[in-house]
Interface confidence: low
Amino acid sequence: SGVFQLQLQEFINERGVLASGRPCEPGCRTFFRVCLKHFQAVVSPGPCTFGTVSTPVLGTNSFAVRDDSSGGGRNPLQLPFNFTWPGTFSLIIEAWHAPGDDLRPEALPPDALISKIAIQGSLAVGQNWLLDEQTSTLTRLRYSYRVICSDNYYGDNCSRLCKKRNDHFGHYVCQPDGNLSCLPGWTGEYCQQPICLSGCHEQNGYCSKPAECLCRPGWQGRLCNECIPHNGCRHGTCSTPWQCTCDEGWGGLFCDQDLNYCTHHSPCKNGATCSNSGQRSYTCTCRPGYTGVDCELELSECDSNPCRNGGSCKDQEDGYHCLCPPGYYGLHCEHSTLSCADSPCFNGGSCRERNQGANYACECPPNFTGSNCEKKVDRCTSNPCANGGQCLNRGPSRMCRCRPGFTGTYCELHVSDCARNPCAHGGTCHDLENGLMCTCPAGFSGRRCEVRTSIDACASSPCFNRATCYTDLSTDTFVCNCPYGFVGSRCEFPVGLPPSFPW
């Protein structure tokens, strides 16, 4: 589809006469009829196969024709065609005289023709005008012409349709040759494919509009290049979606079991040394001067009761000082001026002379200690409770309050996760460092063997002789459907075939 454009520029009819030689009265009021048709070696009358157009009266006798295209007028003249431009044409231009306003052929005088010109030739589609001038005896016509494609048509023959669009079916404008030129952000044969955000992962990301990066399931991040770990994965990472590869010091399916409580939580205070002793379990070894499960309590130097023989201890900035009772002296009141005669042993302790009476020693009853049996025994001093257990004095005895996961008199035993028989349907329980595992009997599955799964009793192909096997789902057993000539629960026995007769 295109348009043949004809630009009339100047018509000269100095004498103002018709083709017949008759002068126009009062002058030749001139209009034109144009006929465009297929190429003819000799241009002849007949149908204007490519189109026809008429002008209004453009001037009298001799005149220049104004370019009216900008004002919506009819110069250049337009001869549209709805076919592939063949590259050749024939053109007939007639100049007529119109005495009145009616330009229909039947309203004109019989000799109204002023001039008639005909040309033919080749013409390629293009923007450039071809200038031509045709002269007859009395008239001269200067004009130019060209062929251009209609809107949305392109190519050498105006045969290529291209309508710019920006919708679901394409996002493009048209190049001069009719090829598509994608709008920014679009690609593909019909510019339907958005160009995703630069760097968007080819496999894991996609987009529905330009500069977007939407992630496929299992991926995340601005460029969809980060995998999403298993839902609930606490201290783990992934290299492919839904993985949960535990960070160092963590274990379990969701990496939520702390195998390195010391590093992750630093529970020991005041420079104490921390030792991991199982899942979420630890022991703090305190530096001198500190005590408590986490060594969080600062010991007074007097807390170790350094003063003997009933001496009282006073804390000082640079240490401590013992105030000795009568009969004792020395840094720790360890030297006595007493003898057994002075009954120095308290709480029922018995006195023994030493060094020919110059000294003595007290033998203390249970629950008492000290040079003079003056101290009640603290059975927790030796910190006998293992695995972070808390020691409690209970009168003459002591007891350990254990942390979760431990038991025994001294919290020395790890509680078995299997003790509560967690595996259903006869599953076998295995204690693991980070929990337990159930080994399920046939027909059951799940973390605790809680899911009943039907056994395909036919999986082992128990039927012989091409018998058909069926699984009885209620008993998880099989049934063999024997072919003709076989019997038995597995169709393993051939039936005695009847003898063959000679007739």
Epitope: D151, N152, K163, N166, D167
Partner: antibody
Framework: EVQLLESGGGLVKSGGSLRLSCAAS????????MSWVRQAPGKGLEWVAI????????YSADSVKGRFTISRDNSKNTLYLQLNSLRAEDTAVYYC????????????WGQGTMVTVSS | LPVLTQPPSVSVSPGQTASITCSAD??????VSWYQQKPGQSPVLVIY???KRPSGIPERFSGSNSGNTATLTISGTQTMDEADYLC?????????FGGGTKVTVL
Amino acid sequence: EVQLLESGGGLVKSGGSLRLSCAASGFTFRSHWMSWVRQAPGKGLEWVAIISYDGSNKYSADSVKGRFTISRDNSKNTLYLQLNSLRAEDTAVYYCAKAGGGNVGFDIWGQGTMVTVSS
Amino acid sequence: LPVLTQPPSVSVSPGQTASITCSADKLGTKYVSWYQQKPGQSPVLVIYQDAKRPSGIPERFSGSNSGNTATLTISGTQTMDEADYLCQSWDRSDVVFGGGTKVTVL
């Protein structure tokens, strides 16, 4: 369900005023251009006015310029048309219509409200 | 404002094809929508962007637009298709409707 419901029509004397309303539901009203189109008895459709999604752009037909004003309240999901200086030739059914994006045309129409101007 | 010109009426027998035209200068460079309106009812969009059908519109409705003419074609016309059909386009900021074509199914 996507719906447009016009109201406010009626009988009014020449030179009088009316205010038409169009209540929208079932779609995101604030995201769409909206328009008023009228149809005189026995005649074809005549476009009256159109307003952008946020109310910043308003256009109207030459026949109603200076007399009719289109507006909207996105918080109430409502489109309005203020009709002033009414003439007998304004008698018509007034339709509220949702304009689809990208030259889709008017994809949702209300049931219309009748405006009769008596001289 | 450019005028969209439609024939006032078109008659068609059931099962036959009805073609309704809508003309304007260089209409093929613009997008055209078509509406169906039955007596006493609101218009219904049947074709948009020259040839696309909204969901729920039967496949027998099709459209085309080139040069100066847009065409609505109803293939295998049914009695229920008897209605007024109006074309619509845009010119700058104005909306332009055709005068409408009454389709009668004989």
